[in-house]
């Protein structure tokens, strides 16, 4: 069966300078590989954060995800500002070894306004 | 630099229990899961348990259940490793190790060695 | 289980792959481990199928495809003689294995 990957919120509203939670759940671990969240879509989009070890600032995983068993792939942005706004997307990927990693399972994505305090 | 130092190997009887442990330094501890492995007399690598960062999941080869525990103290940046019923075929180095995010190794400590004899 | 053949054997300079099969590409994560002598620490050349410890030399890079991972050592050296173990963790059972490891000899 094909992993699904949940974004609950379509949107959220955020105060400048706060802290907002995007909420990723996969339910499946298989094929084995990355997960990522990335803000806009297509050739322009950014990578927010990746679940393999290497330090984002101002974002941190919200659950354990060194669980084996994890399947919640939530971030935590802190000291949200205006340039945050955008559509985020939770990835599935598999892995590639040799060559980039495949995509094969987006979110619906969570559109974050930042409101001005 | 990461550091990982075992400590608490020793001879014991069979039958008898001891407790490894496994001071960490160099790293936020607290974040990484780790691993124990084991290697006996002229033999290859073999693991044995694992622990998620947070300490609450805890993952074992059949051959132990039942008879080792692995635990944290995040506090302390420590691991441990409970052994008990102890018999001639435990005798082996005993390594922790720091995972990587996919649960492989990337860091090891020197070992301690436990030998278990009458 | 993972299986490498026991022994693999080189001159200097040239390049040596060791094969590691059994794995499910699926489901496996494959590393590769060095020992230079029995009970002293290994130590990762690979992990994550290809990704390189920034301490170990560029000579050493890995790739995995299908049900096998290699490990290749491009230009060995004699400090390279050890034994390499091949890793893997299999997230359907969450369980991590190792290969019985194969002895590099350089000539």
């Known amino acids: 069966t094909e992993v699904k990957v949940t974004q609950p919120e379509k949107s959220v509203s955020v105060a400048a300078g706060d802290s907002t939670i995007l909420n990723c759940t996969v339910t499946s671990l298989l094929p084995v590989g990355p997960i990522r969240w990335y803000r806009g879509v297509g050739q322009s989009r950014l990578l927010i954060y990746s679940f393999t070890g290497e330090h984002f600032p101002r974002i941190r995983n919200v659950s354990d995800t060194t669980k084996r068993n994890n399947m919640d792939f939530s971030i935590r942005i802190s000291n949200v500002t205006p340039e945050d706004a955008g559509t985020y997307y939770c990835v599935k990927f598999q892995r590639g070894s040799s060559e980039p990693d495949t995509e094969i399972q987006s979110g619906g994505g969570t559109e974050v306004y930042v409101l001005a305090k | 630099d990461v550091q990982l130092v075992e400590s608490g190997g020793g001879v014991v009887r069979p039958g008898e229990s001891l407790r490894l442990s496994c001071a960490a330094s160099?790293?936020?501890?607290?974040?990484?899961?780790m691993s124990w492995v084991r290697q006996a007399p002229g033999k290859g690598l073999e693991w044995l348990a694992g622990i998620s960062a947070g300490g609450s999941d805890t993952y074992y080869i059949d051959s132990v259940k039942g008879r080792f525990t692995i635990s944290r103290d995040n506090p302390k940046n420590s691991l441990y490793l409970q052994m008990s019923s102890l018999t001639a075929e435990d005798t082996a180095v005993y390594y922790c190790?720091?995972?990587?995010?996919?649960?492989?190794?990337?860091?090891w400590g020197l070992g301690t060695l436990v030998t278990v004899s009458s | 289980a993972l299986t490498q053949p026991a022994s693999v054997s080189a001159n200097p300079g040239e390049t040596v792959k060791i094969t590691c099969s059994g794995g499910?590409?699926?489901?496996?994560?494959y590393a590769w481990y060095q020992q230079k002598s029995p009970g002293s620490a290994p130590v990762t050349v690979i992990h994550s199928d290809d990704k390189r410890p920034s301490d170990i030399p560029s000579r050493f890079s890995g790739s995995a495809s299908g049900s096998a991972a290699t490990l290749i050592i491009t230009g060995v050296r004699v400090e390279d003689e050890a034994v390499y173990y091949c890793g893997g963790y299999d997230g359907r059972t969450y369980i991590n294995t190792f290969g019985a490891g194969t002895t590099l000899t350089v000539l």
């Open positions: 499910d590409y699926y489901s496996t994560y």
């Open positions: 190790a720091r995972e990587t995010w996919n649960h492989l190794f990337d860091y």
């Open positions: 160099g790293f936020t501890f607290s974040s990484y899961a």
